[in-house]
């Protein structure tokens, strides 16, 4: 009896395992070997395909076959017994296009409130993925054990801590990778659960904010008590995407180690310019908080993003408002080289109910105002670039008052 | 592979001061820390300090400040500490070890034993 | 300084029993906790780290677990090569700080 070739021949490629699948085309003959050939492009002769040759199952394993992953390639698959089948040809691939990113491996830490994930790619040293290494993004899903809601988080890097959990409280959550030059998104790693510490003593420092003053730097924190000492450190940011490192070499801020107020002054010559990652941490002498939230920080943005200068000219329905350039120390103005947009805030003097106007022109009229009364103005500048979101602090408020009636001309 | 080798034993005598080293192999040492732990015959294991290679700085315990300094060379991928005015409670093995972030102190040099006597 | 101790300092056991050693610190320190086994005259044996992770090449019958101030290592089958001293170690702040370890001998 002839032999019939085997059919409905799948290839399947995660990461750099590559197998083989095919439907036996005659389930009543036993006994039955399965053999594959492979051809390169451009290449008349057919191969011996290793690790699947005389195949008893209906899956092979040919990894160790060192293939140029961007080349394409053909396959070929026959029946054995006595005699052969017929080759069937499968259609010619290129492994790079048909290989799916594989489950990433994922290491967790937990804090009371927090979860760090250390997330790295299954096979270390990939060759189908050895140019794109350093492009992988990771998507998570992260949910409570207990009420199982899911939340995702996209487009993180190889370490990502989520802040904000409740304690002693387990949390579970899977990662997969993507590749976006490629339009690649990979396989879901296992479930990963862990619980969160009891609640630390100490809680972390918030609300961190970066100001300049002069040549300086002014950094503020809130805390919940008072006795404590403080001490902050940096990290250059693109060392989150670096894939290989899981270590981060955090740097202290000398002028901040070891500081005894919810402040720190530091030169702006500390920083080169680039943007870094800060993140604040008390202690009491005997117990040390967990590490604040991180904030990013533009050296770029943030030494030129001052309160903005005004003039006010009183009518006695409304104020003309001027903006020009902040000033420097030693009276210089600062040039702004990218597109600001100005948030002004005013009240009346004897009340707390502040009004709000935002504006991208240097002159604002502030319309409806009551003569003779004193209002009260404050200002500030944001960048309207998405990437770069940074407001200036508020400026100080000035206080004027309208002119009496029938002055608006 | 990845290895620390550190020098030979010695002797020293009350007062004086021991420098040891740690060469590093299979691994670039400026993407890692070097950690410095000691242990006296016996006992057990005592952190003294860290150096970051890639710019030499370093943390100390309260214990050994002022009387230790670790240094590096990264020509030559190798770290050193160095312990001053030494006692005879000195005489320990001190070893080096590599840190690697949460996988912590996850290769140990063979330790060298460092022997304060008159 | 945080603080680290661990119970008990000596165990006695025999081949295939299961044995736990516990360590607490004095503070939260999360899970920046990392054991390792020592034999007379050898280095340190890096065997878990950040808890409850293992070292490759670390048998599965070692394993760790606990967060926050409370730490166990777990042998659950303890074999010839297993009768060492243990130590934890905090790598959350510094100081770091050791256990004073545990002894595990032949009964």
């Known amino acids: 009896k002839n032999l019939k070739s085997p059919q409905k021949v799948e290839v399947d490629i995660i990461d750099d395992n590559f197998i083989l699948r095919w439907n036996r085309s005659d389930e009543s003959v036993g006994n039955v070997t399965f053999s594959f050939d492979y051809q390169k492009t451009g290449m008349d002769n057919w191969i011996k395909l290793s690790g699947c040759q005389n195949i008893t199952s209906t899956k092979c394993n040919f990894s160790s076959l060192k293939l140029n992953v961007y080349e394409e390639i053909k396959l070929r698959i026959r029946a054995e017994k006595e005699n052969t089948s017929s080759w069937y040809e499968v259609d010619s691939f290129t492994p790079f296009r048909k290989a799916q990113i594989g489950p990433p491996e994922v290491h967790l830490e937990a804090e009371d409130k927090a979860i760090v994930i250390h997330i790295s790619p299954g096979t270390k040293d990939s060759v189908m993925w050895a140019l794109d290494g350093l492009s992988f993004t990771y998507s998570l899903v992260i949910w409570k054990n207990s009420s199982g809601v899911e939340e995702r988080i996209e487009n993180i890097y190889s370490r990502h801590k989520i802040y904000k959990l409740s304690p002693e409280t387990t949390y579970c959550l899977k990662v997969k990778a993507a590749l976006l030059t490629s339009w690649k998104i990979g396989v879901y790693s296992p479930v990963h659960c862990i619980k969160t510490t009891v609640e630390n003593e100490l809680p972390p420092p918030e609300n961190i904010e970066v100001s300049v003053q002069n040549q300086n730097y002014v950094l503020k924190w809130d805390y919940t008590y008072a006795n404590m000492t403080f001490q902050v450190q940096w990290l250059h940011a693109f060392l989150k995407r670096n894939p290989g490192n899981h270590l981060y070499k955090w740097k202290q801020i000398p002028d901040c180690e070891n500081v005894k107020t919810t402040q720190c002054v530091f030169p702006q010559n500390v920083f080169q310019k680039g943007i870094y990652l800060l993140r604040v941490q008390a202690s009491d002498g005997n117990n040390t908080s967990f590490w604040s939230e991180e904030i990013k920080f533009d050296t770029e943005i943030q030494a030129f993003l001052l309160p903005p200068v005004f003039n006010i000219r009183s009518l006695s329905d409304s104020f003309h408002i001027y903006i020009g350039a902040p000033k420097q120390s030693g009276n210089t103005p600062v040039i702004q080289d990218y597109p600001l947009i100005y948030e002004i805030i005013f009240w009346e003097n004897t009340s707390n109910a502040e009004r709000k106007i935002i504006e991208k022109k240097t002159d604002v009229t502030v319309p409806n105002l009551k003569p003779l009364t004193v209002y009260c103005v404050k200002a500030r500048a944001h960048t309207m670039d998405e990437k770069l979101n940074k407001s200036s602090v508020f400026s100080d408020a000035v206080c004027e008052k309208t002119k009496p009636g029938n002055t608006s001309k | 592979q990845v290895q620390l080798v550190q020098s030979g034993a010695e002797v020293k005598k009350p007062g004086a001061s021991v420098k040891v080293s740690c060469k590093a192999s299979?691994?670039?040492?400026?993407?890692?820390?070097i950690h410095w732990v000691r242990q006296a015959p016996g006992q057990g294991l005592e952190w003294m300090g860290r150096?970051?290679?890639?710019?030499?700085?370093?943390k100390y315990a309260p214990k050994f400040q002022g009387r230790v300094t670790m240094t590096r060379d990264t020509s030559i991928s190798t770290a050193y500490m160095e312990l001053s005015r030494l006692r005879s409670d000195d005489t320990v093995v001190y070893y080096c070890?590599?840190?690697?972030?949460?996988?912590?102190?996850?290769?140990w040099g063979q330790g060298t034993l460092v022997t304060v006597s008159s | 300084d945080i603080q680290m101790t661990q119970s008990p300092s000596s165990l006695s056991t025999s081949v295939g029993d299961r044995v736990t050693i516990t360590c607490k610190t004095s503070?939260?320190?999360?899970?920046?906790v990392a054991w390792y086994q020592q034999k007379p005259g050898k280095a340190p044996k890096p065997l878990i780290y950040?808890?409850?992770y293992r070292y490759s090449g670390v048998p599965s019958r070692f394993s760790g677990s606990g967060s926050g101030t409370d730490f166990t290592l777990t042998i659950s089958s303890v074999q010839p090569e297993d009768f060492a001293t243990y130590y934890c170690?905090?790598?959350?702040?510094?100081?770091?700080?050791f256990g004073p370890g545990t002894k595990l001998d032949i009964k």
């Open positions: 070890a590599r840190y690697h972030g949460y996988w912590a102190l996850d290769y």
């Open positions: 170690h905090q790598y959350f702040s510094y100081p770091y700080t």
């Open positions: 503070q939260n320190v999360g899970t920046n």
């Open positions: 950040s808890t409850s």
């Open positions: 150096i970051d290679p890639e710019d030499a700085e370093t």
């Open positions: 299979g691994f670039n040492i400026k993407d890692y820390y």
